[in-house]
């Protein structure tokens, strides 16, 4: 049962407190723990912030850090959707140059099939 439901940080919560925000989320939402100094409060989000992806788990869905090298945003633990500036996206990974047989599309920073 959500308490403090009028508090905007309790949106989408199954369980919420004034001090720590959400501690559990509604089924389709993702838990994200915002840390500020030595304090923290939980949020329930429809989509995870940049640099995180939505990890589904039996106990609770949560946002998890994208750990693909040189990746800014990812769809899952091992599939990048947007690389850091200066890197090209190819099959969910980030490269400083496109592999042989692929050319960089500068506007999207993706590697596409074709000659250079």
């Amino acid at each position: 049962r959500a308490s403090y439901v009028s508090n905007p940080i309790c949106k989408g919560c199954l369980s919420c407190s004034k001090d720590n925000g959400c501690s559990r989320c509604q089924q389709k939402l993702f838990f994200f723990l915002r840390r500020e100094g030595m304090r923290q409060y939980g949020e329930c989000l429809h989509s995870c912030p940049s640099g995180y992806y939505g990890h589904r788990a039996p106990d609770m869905n949560r946002c998890a850090r994208c750990r693909i090298e040189n990746c800014d945003s990812c769809f899952s633990k091992d599939f990048c959707t947007k690389c850091k500036v200066g890197f090209y996206l190819h099959r969910g990974r980030c490269f400083d140059e496109c592999p042989d047989g692929f050319a960089p599309l500068e506007e999207t920073m993706e590697c596409v099939e074709g000659c250079e």
Epitope: S15, S17, N20, C22, S23, R24, F31, F32, L33, R34, R35, G37, M38, R39, Q40, G42, Y52, H55, A57, P58, D59, M60, R62, C63, A64, R65, R67
Partner: antibody
Framework: EVKLVESGGGLVKPGGSLKFSCAAS????????MSWVRQTPEKRLEWVAS???????YYPDSVKGRFTISRDNVRNILYLQMSSLRSEDTAMYFC???????????????????WGQGTSVTVSS | DIVMTQSHKFMSTSVGDRVSITCKAS??????VAWYQQKPGQSPKLLIY???TRHTGVPDRFTNSGSGTDYTLTISSVQAEDLALYYC?????????FGGGTKLEIK
């Protein structure tokens, strides 16, 4: 292979100081938060300090002002400087990867995923 | 500070048995719970984090269930090498705190 090797423990008198280190290898040291955890003679585990990849430091009240955690990202070494030592600081001190209180990861780095073999500290007169 | 309580200091079991080690937090920790195994003469090793995710290389006989304040580490079929101390830890808010440990003994 992730490897953490502590050194520099020993016997010290109450009120004394000690600095020990943890040499890290097998991973990108500068990208990870690092922590110190101690195990008392009664086998209780207590968090001692954490340092973020960016150098922000965190301590529990029991050691704040007495212990200092630091890191050398060039030599891949984590340090713990302890001063004003008390008998209750007697423990095995482990360095561990992870445990950054300033950042939410949602994965293994929120816990402490690799630990060194530990270095023993005895505070006694 | 959040207090993590492991009610059993010792548990005795036989090879092949199913065993459950419990841990209770003094407040809701949003599944931010890790479990560590410490074998005699060794340092602790991470088994599980975020309540249900097994760390790299951890056998699937180790599982955790629970949410809110109550968490349970289950070993579905105990092996002789599982003789160890087991600790829970909350990684929800600082100071990070650990349970007192449960020593698993093999009959």
């Amino acid at each position: 292979e992730v490897k953490l090797v502590e050194s520099g423990g020993g016997l010290v008198k109450p009120g004394g100081s000690l600095k020990f280190s943890c040499a890290a290898s097998g991973f990108s040291f500068s990208s990870y938060a690092m922590s110190w955890v101690r195990q008392t003679p009664e086998k209780r585990l207590e968090w001692v300090a954490s340092i973020s990849s960016g150098g922000s430091t965190y301590y529990p009240d029991s050691v704040k002002g007495r212990f200092t955690i630091s890191r050398d990202n060039v030599r891949n070494i984590l340090y713990l400087q302890m001063s004003s030592l008390r008998s209750e600081d007697t423990a095995m001190y482990f360095c561990a990867r992870g445990g950054d209180p300033g950042v939410y990861n949602g994965d293994y780095e929120d816990a402490m995923d690799y630990w060194g073999q530990g270095t023993s500290v005895t505070v006694s007169s | 500070d959040i207090v993590m309580t492991q009610s059993h200091k010792f548990m005795s079991t036989s090879v092949g048995d199913r065993v459950s080690i419990t841990c209770k937090a003094s407040q809701d920790v949003s599944s931010a719970v890790a479990w560590y195994q410490q074998k005699p003469g060794q340092s602790p090793k991470l088994l599980i984090y975020w309540a249900s995710t097994r760390h790299t290389g951890v056998p699937d006989r180790f599982t955790n269930s629970g949410s809110g304040t109550d968490y349970t580490l289950t070993i579905s079929s105990v092996q002789a090498e599982d003789l160890a101390l087991y600790y829970c830890q909350q990684h929800y808010s600082t100071p990070w705190t650990f349970g007192g440990g449960t020593k698993l003994e093999i009959k």
